[in-house]
Structure formats: structure tokens, C-alpha cells
């Protein structure tokens, strides 16, 4: 396993609709055709997998139909969008990139993007 540098923004604020987007960029030293991108969430020293996609260089990422993630790829950049976020989902979201095939296998893990999610205030009832 060979190491690879992965860069991602330090902080992102989710929209009022619970959507957060960030770019995950990797310095590809190899000529991989198959790349796997995984988003991990770290909170309270617990790490869980949020979503993952395997894609062919030059093609679109395809997450599972029930995934909360969508994304596009351009060269060595992956534009990730996470939907359906709520305040309780605030945490550090780590981008993990693997150059799967052909060999050699490269693995890169970013420092993480702190995503802040603020639940919208409910609209007050109005009397007419």
C-alpha cells in the first residue's frame, strides 16, 4: 500500500436545507482507472462510513440509490454533496481515496472537513 496526499477544506457550513458540498482532491501518482472514494464521519472518537462510490477515471461517480451522497469527478478532484443533514450530524467528514486498479494500490486519507449543520428555526404561527 502506497500513501497518497488528499486535500479537503477545513470547514463547511451546511445550507438551511441540510445540504453540504466540498471538494476532495487527491494527488494521483499512478495511472489508475478505477478509483474508490469513501466519506467517513468522525464524531466522539467514533468513525462511521457515510457513503462510498467506485468510479472509472473520466466517468461520473455512482453512489447507491439510497445514499445520502452525490458527486461528480473531474480529473483528480471529486465534488461531494451530502444531503439530508441535521444538527445532530455535525462532525468531521473525512475523504478517503483509493486507487484500486491496476496496481500499485494507493491509499489517501484527508484531514477531514468539519461540517456544521444548524437546524432551521420553525416558522412561527401567524394569526390573521
Amino acid at each position: 500500500c502506497k500513501a497518497m496526499h488528499v486535500a479537503q477544506p477545513a470547514v463547511v457550513l451546511a445550507s438551511s436545507r441540510g445540504i453540504a458540498s466540498f471538494v476532495c482532491e487527491y494527488a494521483s501518482p499512478g495511472k489508475a482507472t478505477e478509483v474508490r472514494v469513501t466519506v467517513l464521519r468522525q464524531a466522539d472518537s467514533q468513525v462511521t462510513e457515510v457513503c462510498a462510490a467506485t468510479y472509472m477515471m473520466g466517468n461520473e461517480l455512482t453512489f447507491l440509490d439510497d445514499s445520502i451522497c452525490t458527486g461528480t469527478s473531474s480529473g483528480n478532484q471529486v465534488n461531494l454533496t451530502i444531503q439530508g443533514l441535521r444538527a445532530m450530524d455535525t462532525g468531521l467528514y473525512i475523504c478517503k481515496v483509493e486507487l484500486m486498479y491496476p496496481p500499485p494500490y494507493y491509499l489517501g486519507i484527508g484531514n477531514g472537513t468539519q461540517i456544521y449543520v444548524i437546524d432551521p428555526e420553525p416558522c412561527p404561527d401567524s394569526d390573521f
Partner: antibody, heavy 125, light 107 residues
Framework: EVQLVESGGGLVQPGGSLRLSCAAS????????MHWVRQAPGKGLEWVSY????????YYADSVKGRFTISRDNSKNTLYLQMNSLRAEDTAVYYC??????????????????WGQGTLVTVSS | DIQMTQSPSSLSASVGDRVTITCQAS??????LNWYQQKPGKAPKLLIY???NLETGVPSRFSGSGSGTDFTFTISSLQPEDIATYYC?????????FGQGTKVEIK
């Protein structure tokens, strides 16, 4: 027993089409990277194409790009090679082969460890 | 594309002889090189993977070495059943490419 069995070869006219099948037994094709390799009569081995375990990634030799399509049907545990616009120089024995590395394996060891018996494709008028 | 140059293209040796085949890659492929044996009318068989690792069930008289661009395949004591064509293959850049083959015959 781990086995690959090709079928679908035969005689076809230039410009015609054929679909080769490679049925796997003893293992699941979706767990491996799969390849097609061909060998023209009396010549050496030529790598043709590959497909990833997920099926999301494919690659082709320049000599067949745009004419050949690799695919798999996981429910049938079968690999395919759709060959269109065939030319005389496509005449060869076509082998399917399994890359020994499991798709999700931590042990990154490679090599075509299982091959089919081959199917002959003859392109001639 | 990475070119794989194998030599010699053919050789004739006596039973018990040490046989050496070389394979040169046009660029660095680290140790991502495999060696295959193909007997007439049969599919190729993997003998050596990652330049020097012997595939399970393959006799120990077969060995491989090398890294980067220069590789060697050796049969320490040639046996009658070793009559075949041997191919090297790089396994790190698409398209995967094979050497042109070395046909081994018995004198």
C-alpha cells in the same frame, strides 16, 4: 472446481458481429477483475479488455476500442465480449481470464490465475 | 503503452540444462510482472507473479527475479514437460502488455 468456459466463437464476415460468453463456476465473477486476452494463429498473446468487479470501470486495447464492449451479468455469473465491425485482424482464439486479486482484498496480489479454454473467432469472407 | 521485449524468441536446450529468459520493460514497472507458460493448443498458465513469487503448485525449478525494467525467468533444470512458449506480462499500466514469447524446445 474453479473454471471458465468460453463460447460464441465462429466464422463471421468482415463488418459482422459476435458475442462471446465466458461462464464462471466455482467463484463469483463480481468479486474479481476479469479480462479478455486473444491470440492470433501462430502469434503471441494480446490483452484486449478488462472490467472491474463493480462493472463501473472498463478499459480496452486501442486495436478494439469503439468496436468491442465488455460486460458481465452477475445473475448468470457470466462475462461477455460484444464484438462489432469485425476485421480480418480480429481472427484469433479469445480467452477470458480472472485476475487473482479479490476486489476488496487487502492482500494486493495480481496475475491471471484462471483461464478459459479459448474460443476461436474467424473473420473471413 | 509499455513495450515488453523478451529474448531470446526461441531456444533449444538439453534436459537438465539451466534455461534463462529475459524480459525488458520500456519503463519502470516496479515488480508488477508475471510469467506464463503456454503449451500448444492450451490456455496460458500463471507460473510467477509479482516478478519473483512462485504460484501455488508450480515446481520449484521455475523462478523469477528483477525489478524496475529488467527481469529474468529461469528454469534451473529443464524437463521434457517444460516444452512450451513462455510469456512475460506487465500488470501496472493499461493496456496490459505481453512480451512476444520465448519458445523453449529440447535438443
Amino acid at each position: 472446481e474453479v473454471q471458465l468456459v468460453e463460447s460464441g466463437g465462429g466464422l463471421v464476415q468482415p463488418g459482422g458481429s459476435l458475442r462471446l460468453s465466458c461462464a464462471a463456476s466455482g467463484f463469483t465473477v463480481s468479486s474479481y477483475y476479469m479480462h479478455w486476452v486473444r491470440q492470433a494463429p501462430g502469434k503471441g498473446l494480446e490483452w484486449v479488455s478488462y472490467i472491474s468487479g463493480s462493472g463501473s470501470s472498463t478499459y480496452y486495447a486501442d486495436s478494439v476500442k469503439g468496436r468491442f464492449t465488455i460486460s458481465r451479468d452477475n445473475s448468470k455469473n457470466t462475462l461477455y465480449l460484444q464484438m462489432n465491425s469485425l476485421r480480418a485482424e480480429d481472427t484469433a482464439v479469445y480467452y477470458c481470464a480472472r485476475d487473482r486479486m479479490l476486489v476488496d482484498s487487502v492482500n494486493r496480489v495480481f496475475g491471471f490465475d484462471v483461464w478459459g479454454q479459448g474460443t476461436l473467432v474467424t473473420v473471413s469472407s | 503503452d509499455i513495450q515488453m521485449t523478451q529474448s531470446p524468441s526461441s531456444l533449444s536446450a538439453s534436459v537438465g540444462d539451466r534455461v534463462t529468459i529475459t524480459c525488458q520493460a520500456s519503463q519502470d514497472i516496479s515488480n508488477y510482472l508475471n510469467w506464463y507458460q503456454q503449451k500448444p493448443g492450451k490456455a496460458p498458465k500463471l507460473l510467477i507473479y509479482d516478478a519473483s513469487n512462485l504460484e501455488t503448485g508450480v515446481p520449484s525449478r521455475f523462478s523469477g527475479s528483477g525489478s524496475g525494467t529488467d527481469f529474468t525467468f529461469t528454469i534451473s533444470s529443464l524437463q521434457p514437460e517444460d516444452i512450451a512458449t513462455y510469456y512475460c506480462q506487465q500488470h501496472t499500466n493499461f493496456p496490459f502488455t505481453f512480451g512476444q514469447g520465448t519458445k523453449v524446445e529440447i535438443k
